[in-house]
Amino acid sequence: MRTEAQVPALQPPEPGLEGAMGHRTLVLPWVLLTLCVTAGTPEVWVQVRMEATELSSFTIRCGFLGSGSISLVTVSWGGPNGAGGTTLAVLHPERGIRQWAPARQARWETQSSISLILEGSGASSPCANTTFCCKFASFPEGSWEACGSLPPSSDPGLSAPPTPAPILRADLAGILGVSGVLLFGCVYLLHLLRRHKHRPAPRLQPSRTSPQAPRARAWAPSQASQAALHVPYATINTSCRPATLDTAHPHGGPSWWASLPTHAAHRPQGPAAWASTPIPARGSFVSVENGLYAQAGERPPHTGPGLTLFPDPRGPRAMEGPLGVR
């Protein structure tokens, strides 16, 4: 059973507060507070397993540890999706699955995790040092990607443990912009709450929770974010590429990676069948990209004939790989 970081549920605003703060100033702090609480860093974990029966057969499992709703999952190999990787499968939480050789069976395991079985025969079959990546588009977090591969000396039947590790990538301006808005909002919220604290609050019912409790919760750094300041993992350069597919060209712009491992308590544990020896995790990273995604099932707005579901500097078709996007 794997443990997931839970975002605490927010209580609705107390009726007694309306007299103290007024209806107008009441709504904004709670909206901002919700943003602050849900602005915690989500994580993506990836687990790669080589089957003991077929040496070149792999099973990839990926999961999303976040409070948002997943709108699309893209599994790729040979590197991150949109950075030279080739799409293996695309999974939509309502509309289904599209998959590509050598993928044999992609499926949803839970509402926030997927698995993909890869065939072990043929020219396009994976090899032991292939990097597999999972990209989760979610609302409101945006797009998060993690990659992983088997350790070089792993025995058949063993798997690399699930390896989440948050990193920043891509559209910095957008990320900083959103972060700035959130930071400003949170500071403003703190200011409002401080101001409210110095005002006499009439008839606050003792049984109810005061807004200070959620505030403390919102601002307390999570284990994950505290732990995300230790030794970085190394990013893999994979020498094993898909043999039969045309791989997308790498990004033209600078590609930089700042990998940060995640606290072990947040490392999801798979079921007994996935139990693995403590192999050091390697080549795992997560990226957040600018742009918020529509709720699952909603059609993204058209931006012209070359719409892609994810932003990509190389043009409309480069990101999607085998998926044809109108």
Partner: antibody
């Protein structure tokens, strides 16, 4: 107007191979996947596989692996399906269909190609 | 493989009537179900996708509903041009599978 024009009917001998085509027009060929379906006389449809004209990636129904091979010629906006080791079981109408990956469905279907396997 | 069952092979109706064609999936497929119409001697045409969204140009007398395992295509005010065979398709899992089809006959 978006169209998928398929090649004409084929009468072939058992054990031989046949290659049928699906020529796309009215849209950017590489922007959409093309899938293939089989409809045997008096029975339902079966999904054979999918092809990405963009990069040549394929996906097959396990039942048709070794039977069907999907290829593409970007220069002529044409997708092909080759059927080999034909038997009477392969006699059917074969359709190509365009997959709309925004809305996830087959929005346009080809005209269909009738393949008859007979000695 | 996911089995899509259209229990009624044939349905008879009159012009102006309302008819419901059902499709049952052997496992949960969320809303990953489409409906296609095929008139005699023609290629299939898209009617409904994502269980309930009408394809462009499809008359609003065609309505799709359901999610999970049970899906229904309802035709209100049936017209003579609706004489056709109707197929459901699931694309929740590989391989994609079609229902056996329901032929609509006009009395």
């Amino acid at each position: 107007e978006v169209q998928l024009q398929q090649s004409g009917p084929e009468l072939v001998k058992p054990g031989s191979s046949v290659k049928i085509s699906c020529k796309a027009s009215g849209y950017t060929f590489t922007d959409y996947n093309l899938d293939w379906m089989k409809q045997s006389h008096g029975s339902s449809l079966e999904w054979i596989g999918a092809m990405s004209p963009n990069n040549g990636a394929t996906s097959y129904n396990q039942k048709f692996k070794g039977k069907a091979t999907l290829t593409v010629d970007k220069s002529s906006s044409t997708a092909y399906m080759e059927l080999r080791s034909l038997t009477s079981e392969d006699s059917a109408v074969y359709y190509c269909a365009r997959w709309d990956s925004n809305s996830w469905y087959f929005d346009v279907w080809g005209t269909g190609t009738t393949v008859t396997v007979s000695s | 493989d996911i089995v899509m069952t259209q229990s009624q092979k044939f349905m008879s109706t009159s012009v102006g009537d309302r008819v419901s064609i059902t499709c049952k999936a052997s496992q949960i497929v969320r809303t990953a179900v489409d409906w296609y119409q095929q008139k005699s001697g023609q290629s299939p045409k898209a009617l409904i996708y994502s269980a309930s969204t009408r394809h462009t140009g499809v008359p609003d007398r065609f309505t799709g509903s359901g999610s999970g395992t049970d899906f229904t295509l309802t035709i209100d005010n049936v017209q003579s041009e609706d004489l056709a065979e109707y197929f459901c398709l699931q694309h929740w899992n590989y391989p994609y599978t079609f229902g056996g089809g329901t032929k609509l006959e006009i009395k």
